[in-house]
């Protein structure tokens, strides 16, 4: 979380912001919040970016103003304009891409003042992974795909039964580039599995940490899948 | 160059499937916002539905639960499945990559629904 | 679910005349969300203008979009034979994720 305050003669405002992570190929979320004033028309939200000229999105008098915005964000950016008067400034940015990923600055100015917060957003892939029974198999054999990571991740099986036990010898993982050469999918084989336990496959990165578990029985299979994002630090 | 070209339309009975095709060349579908929208005969643009790069997909509600979106990443090739399909399906369809906005659009395959 | 409604639906105009195209959406759409399509008869629609006042890559310079919030604008400053055609406006964003005009068609007085 980083929490800015503005500087100069006038009033400082409080603006919030929180560092987070965009999934390429998925629309993004840079949130920012801020002091809210009373008027609409007295509201300027500018977001800009580190190493960038023009402007990547400007909110002004209760509307969009992208005269100044710089090419790379054109039809991208917005901003949830019935929540501005909330003090919702956050930036919503289409089919986020690697190159989005830098230091972001949310400056406000109100009648009460001014304030930034600057935010770091990351950028990479991640995506729940599946565990199934691989029937294909000599032994009983446990297969955990996940569609897209990137940058590459650490693939950490854990069983319920065998809780700290180190299955790295039983296991193997391969990493497979997807067609637009930047994303991979993530393969991780499990071998010499056993009945009635509870098996993990725990794929992270420095983006996310995604689950999916696996309990098989006698008489059925239950799986289940979570998904984290990491860093997700206020300002 | 950058093209879309589509296929597979055609004369279907009511409740039968087809599955239309869209095929890309210059850039990669993968890594793009890629959309079917349609033109019924004398009428206006209907988005149908959009797939993400990562894979997320979309449906407007006159289709969903019929029509499924797809990509064949190997073959940079997107699908739409249709089902169930009715007469007011018949239309002309169109892919379109949306980057900035919907830049690139095929020629249209066109889809008539009838007994 | 966000509505646009262009007007007017017909617009009749002669070449060199200027002609004002309104799309309005039923509640707030982004500026950057907003773009504006040509369609000739058997063609495919061709983008025109994105972010609202952005011209796509080939589109000449009688064509300019503005507009904010609620009201967009596509204006043509000298008609060219060429340009009567019919004119749609498109979001993206909301539920349903994108949502077209229902048209102006721009025809020869």
């Known amino acids: 979380l980083i929490i800015g305050f503005g500087i100069s003669g006038r009033h400082s405002i409080t603006v919030t912001t929180v560092a987070s992570a965009g999934n390429i190929g998925e629309d993004g979320i840079l949130s920012c919040t801020f002091e809210p004033d009373i008027k609409l028309s007295d509201i300027v939200i500018q977001w800009l970016k580190e190493g960038v000229l023009g402007l990547v999105h400007e909110f002004k008098e209760g509307k969009d103003e992208l005269s100044e915005q710089d090419e790379m964000f054109r039809g991208r950016t917005a901003v949830f304009a019935d929540q501005v008067i909330v003090g919702n400034a956050s930036l919503r940015l289409k089919n986020v891409q690697l190159t989005d990923a830098g230091t972001y600055k949310c400056y406000i100015i109100t009648s009460k003042g001014k304030g930034n917060a600057n935010l770091e957003y990351k950028t990479g892939a991640f995506s729940m992974p599946e565990v199934n029974v691989d029937y294909n198999a000599s032994s009983e054999t446990l297969r955990c795909e996940a569609p897209r990571w990137f940058p590459q991740p650490t693939v950490v099986w854990a069983s319920q039964v065998d809780q700290g036990a180190n299955f790295s010898e039983v296991s193997n993982t391969s990493f497979e580039l997807n067609s637009e050469n930047v994303t991979m999918k993530v393969v991780s084989v499990l071998y010499n599995v056993t009945i009635n336990n509870t098996y993990s496959c725990m794929i992270e990165n420095d983006i996310a940490k995604a689950t999916g578990d696996i309990k098989v029985t006698e008489s059925e299979i239950k799986r289940r899948s979570h998904l984290q994002l990491l860093n997700s630090k206020a300002s | 160059e950058v093209q879309l070209v589509e296929s597979g339309g055609g004369l279907i009975q009511p409740g039968g499937s087809l599955r239309l095709s869209c095929a890309a060349s210059?850039?990669?579908?993968?890594?793009?916002?890629m959309n079917w929208v349609r033109q019924a005969p004398g009428k206006g643009l209907e988005w149908v539905s959009v797939?993400?790069?990562?894979?997320?997909?979309y449906y407007a509600d006159s289709v969903k639960g019929r029509v499924t979106i797809s990509r064949d990443n190997s073959k940079n090739t997107l699908y739409l499945q249709m089902n169930s399909l009715r007469a007011e399906d018949t239309a002309v369809y169109y892919c379109?990559?949306?980057?900035?906005?919907?830049?690139?659009w095929g020629q249209g395959t066109t889809v008539t629904v009838s007994s | 679910e966000i509505v646009l409604t262009q007007s007017p639906g017909t617009l009749s105009l002669s070449p060199g005349e200027r002609a004002t195209l309104s799309c309005r959406a039923s509640?707030?759409?982004?500026?950057?969300?907003l773009a504006w399509y040509q369609q000739k008869p058997g063609q495919a629609p061709r983008l025109l203008i994105y972010?609202?006042?952005s011209r796509a890559t080939g589109i000449p310079d009688r064509f300019s979009g503005s507009g904010s919030g609620t009201d967009f604008t596509l204006t043509i400053s000298r008609l060219e034979p060429e340009d009567f055609a019919v004119y749609y406006c498109?979001?993206?964003?909301?539920?349903?994720?994108?949502?077209f005009g229902q048209g102006t068609k721009l025809e020869i007085k």
């Open positions: 379109a990559r949306d980057t900035y906005a919907m830049d690139v």
């Open positions: 210059g850039f990669t579908v993968s890594s793009n916002y």
């Open positions: 797939i993400y790069g990562s894979g997320r997909t």
């Open positions: 509640q707030s759409v982004s500026s950057s969300y």
């Open positions: 972010g609202a006042s």
């Open positions: 498109q979001q993206y964003g909301s539920s349903p994720m994108y949502t």
